[in-house]
C-alpha cells in the first residue's frame, strides 16, 4: 500500500510532568518546589526552554491519500508522524526531583506513537471497477517513552500514565542527609 502526501502541519506537544519517570517522593526537596527562600527566583517548569522546539514531542499532521495499486481513497486521511526530542531542556534547581538531572547523561527518551486508530476508507478504482473498502491503522497521538537498557531501540518502556506527579508544598527535609543515606533510594530512582 502506497501513500501520497497531500499537506501537512505540526502540533507541538509539550510533555507534561507525568510523562517522565519520577523518583520516589522522598527524593524531592524544598529547593525544587520553592525557590523563594533560595534567592527569590520564581519556580521554573522542569522542561522550560527558550526554544520550545528544542525539547518537545511534536505531532506532525499529514493529510494523505491511501492508495492500493491503481486505486485511491475518495477522501484524504489525516495521520500523525511523531517527531522531536524528549527530555529536560535546562538544568535548573527546581528540576531536581524529576530525575537525576545533574548528571551529564541519563535515560534516553524517544518521541514515538502512543495511540492508534482504525479508519475505514473507500478506495476508488479506475476503469469502472467497484469501489473497495479498506481499514487503515493510523497514529492518533505521540508520547515520550524511554529506551530501556535491556531492550533494543524499537522496544520502548512507557512511563506515561503511571508516573506520580510531584507533590507541591512539601515540607523541607534536612540538608544534612548524606549521599550514603540516600543510596538505596538513588539506586532505585529509575
Amino acid at each position: 500500500q502506497g501513500w501520497q502526501a497531500f499537506k501537512n502541519d505540526a502540533t507541538e506537544i509539550i510533555p507534561e510532568l507525568g510523562e517522565y519517570p519520577e523518583p520516589p517522593p522522598e527524593l524531592e526537596n524544598n529547593k525544587t518546589m520553592n525557590r523563594a527562600e533560595n534567592g527569590g527566583r520564581p519556580p521554573h517548569h522542569p522542561f522550560e526552554t527558550k526554544d520550545v522546539s528544542e525539547y518537545s514531542c511534536r505531532e506532525l499532521h499529514f493529510t494523505r491519500y491511501v492508495t492500493d495499486g491503481p486505486c485511491r481513497s475518495a477522501k484524504p486521511v489525516t495521520e500523525l508522524v511523531c517527531s522531536g526530542q524528549c527530555g529536560p531542556a535546562r538544568l535548573l534547581p527546581n528540576a531536581i526531583g524529576r530525575g537525576k538531572w545533574w548528571r551529564p547523561s541519563g535515560p534516553d527518551f524517544r518521541c514515538i506513537p502512543d495511540r492508534y486508530r482504525a479508519q475505514r476508507v473507500q478506495l476508488l478504482c479506475p476503469g469502472g471497477e467497484a469501489p473497495r473498502a479498506r481499514k487503515v491503522r493510523l497514529v492518533a497521538s505521540c508520547k515520550c517513552k524511554r529506551l530501556t537498557r535491556f531492550h533494543n531501540q524499537s522496544e520502548l518502556k512507557d512511563f506515561g500514565t503511571e508516573a506520580a506527579r510531584p507533590q507541591k508544598g512539601r515540607k523541607p527535609r534536612p540538608r544534612a542527609r548524606s549521599a550514603k543515606a540516600n543510596q538505596a533510594e538513588l539506586e532505585n530512582a529509575y
Epitope: N29, K31, G39, P46, Q85, G87, P88, A89, R90, L91, L92, P93, A95, I96, R98, G99, K100, W101, W102, R103, P104, S105, G106, P107, D108, R146, L147, T148, R149, F150, R175, A176, R177, S178, A179, A181, N182, Q183, L186, E187, Y190
Partner: antibody, heavy 119, light 111 residues
Framework: EVQLVESGGGLVQPGRSLRLSCAAS????????LHWVRQAPGKGLEWVSG????????DYADSVKGRFTISRDNAKNSLYLQMNSLRVEDTALYYC????????????WGQGTTVTVSS | QSVLTQPPSASGTPGQRVTISCSGS????????VNWYQQLPGTAPKLLIY???QRPSGVPDRFSGSKSGTSASLAISGLQSEDEADYYC????????????FGGGTKLTVL
Amino acid sequence: EVQLVESGGGLVQPGRSLRLSCAASGFTFDDYALHWVRQAPGKGLEWVSGIGWEDDMIDYADSVKGRFTISRDNAKNSLYLQMNSLRVEDTALYYCAGNSRGYGGLDVWGQGTTVTVSS
Amino acid sequence: QSVLTQPPSASGTPGQRVTISCSGSSSNIGGNTVNWYQQLPGTAPKLLIYSNNQRPSGVPDRFSGSKSGTSASLAISGLQSEDEADYYCAAWDDSLEGSYVFGGGTKLTVL
C-alpha cells in the same frame, strides 16, 4: 564570559592530601551542576565526580570513591575536590566542568590544574 | 581499558566525510543519552554533541551525532584542517552505583 578557573594543583607524595578549587564567573552558578574530570598525561578523559545542588546529589567514579570528596559553595561560586590518600595513578590534569542542561553533556570547562603524585 | 570503545585513530582529507564510532553496552549507550567532545591540541575539551544528536549553539552543522542500539557515531562532513583533534564519546553507565564513562578517544588527522 562564562569561565571556570581551577587552582590548588601541585606535586604531592603518595598517601598525602590535596584540595582543588574551581572559581566560576559569568553565569548563574547554582543553575549548573558541576563535575571534575581528569586526564592523565597522554591519556583520555576520566570523569571523577559530580555534584548537583544538595549534599545527596553527588556521584563518584569507583576509582576515587572513599578517597575524594566533592563539595560546592554557592555563596562563593566555588567548587572543591578534597583528595585524600593520593596515589601515583591520580597524577593528571584535573578539569572543572559544568552542565546547564539536564542530561545535556558538560557544556562549560576550565583549563585545568595539574596534580602530580610522586615520591 | 575504556568502558566505551572508539577506534584510536581516524583520518580524512579536506572536504571529506569522516565517521567515528563508539561502542558500548546495554548499561550505558543502550539506555542513556550519548555526548561527544572535541579536544583540540593543548586545550580543554569542548561539548560537540549532546543527547545523541543535538548540537550546542556555535557548533557547525557539519557535526552530527546518531545512536542505534548500543552504538553511537559522530559524523563530520566537509572536513576542515581545524577539525584535527581528539574526539571522545561519553554516556552515563548504570552498572553498580553508576558513573559517567568516556570512550578512549579517537585522534582525527586531516591529511
